[in-house]
Amino acid sequence: TTPEPCELDDEDFRCVCNFSEPQPDWSEAFQCVSAVEVEIHAGGLNLEPFLKRVDADADPRQYADTVKALRVRRLTVGAAQVPAQLLVGALRVLAYSRLKELTLEDLKITGTMPPLPLEATGLALSSLRLRNVSWATGRSWLAELQQWLKPGLKVLSIAQAHSPAFSCEQVRAFPALTSLDLSDNPGLGERGLMAALCPHKFPAIQNLALRNTGMETPTGVCAALAAAGVQPHSLDLSHNSLRATVNPSAPRCMWSSALNSLNLSFAGLEQVPKGLPAKLRVLDLSCNRLNRAPQPDELPEVDNLTLDGNPFLVPGTALPHEGSMNSGVVPAC
């Protein structure tokens, strides 16, 4: 017997559907109507035939009461080929729901997204996460998607993007966006970062994550942030192969005074990089290749320093910096 494609937990909280059959019974997903967090994995199916079965141009207000009864707060949709028109139809209907967090992963969006009709209501998401989503429209995808969202988005995460740079002139500002995560785009690099951080479109960013994004030096990142007018409080550059030295011909970059937390863990560093901010509340240099304790003049003024997992740290060694957070035990790096 084939397993049921959808499983709802006994608390009506989590519902997971895995549609792996070539012609799945989509009605099975109705058991998820009472769930708060829903995951639907479509097994790589092409959802084009759906367009024949639904009227994508129908007024979504006719579904408003039905959709309002859904408890879903967080929805994950993955592994499918989705016509843009179908995606838009879903977003229009979900605008009447309580949905706050949407994750799209391993999707291929085909065709172009139509413009938002005047009477349409945008989807009031607080969080949008995209992983390995390709768009037929190339660089304009964010601008096209953005018009279907209300301006209150707080968290935007874009991983394994096929086009991590955006068409900046088409993108509107994200006035409420406090967290931007571009991690896991190894081809991004510092030039790509400059293209992705559309100037003055991200005025409220507090947390910027750039793990595994092909960054080369903290100074190069500083320059990209300065050019975009982005002033994060927290910056994560972990899991990049960072160079400690700065290109002597590169202009010196002044970090924003707003930055108080910098993560440089798992960055392959053999010495503390040059050109760090002068003052930080938190600096994480754990799991690097530091062969000696950093000298005070090599470090910023820092309240909370983590050096765990570096070769120079032998268990029982005195802590190398006042206020440091080392456990004395080398973690599994």
């Epitope: 608390e11 009506d12 909280f13 989590r14 009472s34 967090e37 408890r71 707060r73 967080r74």
Partner: antibody, heavy 115, light 111 residues
């Protein structure tokens, strides 16, 4: 059998941050459900503060949202509450609770806000 | 937010009598076929204990004298034959939409 245990200081000064941790045994906080904080001022009713779900998603009571952070440490199977800028009105027994029908409760810890 | 109003505030009955506690919601707490309304018992110095979930389902380990009914906005907790150990405060709670809210409680006393 699932068990939840709150820990943290019993006395917090006004304007400071209240910090509590809930340690979960007999179940994983990252495999399912919502993991809540609920409080009860002395002699009063129950108030839901917020939750962090198995996925790391959070939801907060709008009346406290500007002051509350709920986070988790999956390696220790713990989740935590931080409530900033506390006043005497935040004096309460704080419970950690599993699910949205609250079937599993910690025994509660009294936090008094006083100088 | 959904406001839950419990009545009466205090209920005083004799052992063996039937207790009926009411909970009214300011808007429906139903989502399709389910009513996301739950009942709890709290004794002094203890954490609340779940009695009934989704309006009418008896939580494991709870005596069968407890039952629940209702849908949409009107719900009832019934204790068919009161025992002395049923002295407690009873709360209803909705989990249909956040913020998840509680009623103000009904105090059950034994004469």
């Amino acid at each position: 059998q699932l068990q939840l245990q709150e820990s943290g200081p019993g006395l917090v000064k006004p304007s400071e941050t209240l910090s509590l941790t809930c340690t979960v045994s007999g179940g994983s906080i990252s495999s399912d459900s919502a993991w809540n904080w609920i409080r009860q001022p002395p002699g009063k009713g129950l108030e839901w503060i917020g939750y962090i779900s198995y996925s790391g998603s959070t939801s907060y009571n709008p009346s406290l949202k500007s002051r509350v952070t709920i986070s988790r440490d999956t390696s220790k199977n713990q989740f935590s509450l931080k409530l900033s800028s506390v006043t005497a009105a935040d004096t309460a027994v704080y419970y950690c609770v599993r699910g949205l029908r609250f079937a599993y409760w910690g025994q509660g810890t009294l936090v008094t806000v006083s100088s | 937010e959904i406001v839950l109003t419990q009545s009466p505030a205090t209920l005083s009955l004799s052992p063996g009598e039937r207790a009926t506690l009411s909970c009214r919601a300011s808007e429906s707490v139903d989502s399709y076929v389910n009513s996301f309304l739950h009942w709890y018992q709290q004794k002094p110095g203890q954490a609340p204990r779940l009695l009934i979930y989704r309006a009418s389902n008896l939580q494991s380990g709870i005596p069968a004298r407890f039952s629940g009914s209702g849908s949409r906005t009107d719900f009832t907790l019934t204790i068919s034959s009161l025992e002395p150990e049923d002295v407690a405060v009873y709360y209803c709670q909705q989990s249909n939409e956040d913020p998840y809210t509680f009623g103000q409680g009904t105090k059950l006393e034994i004469k």
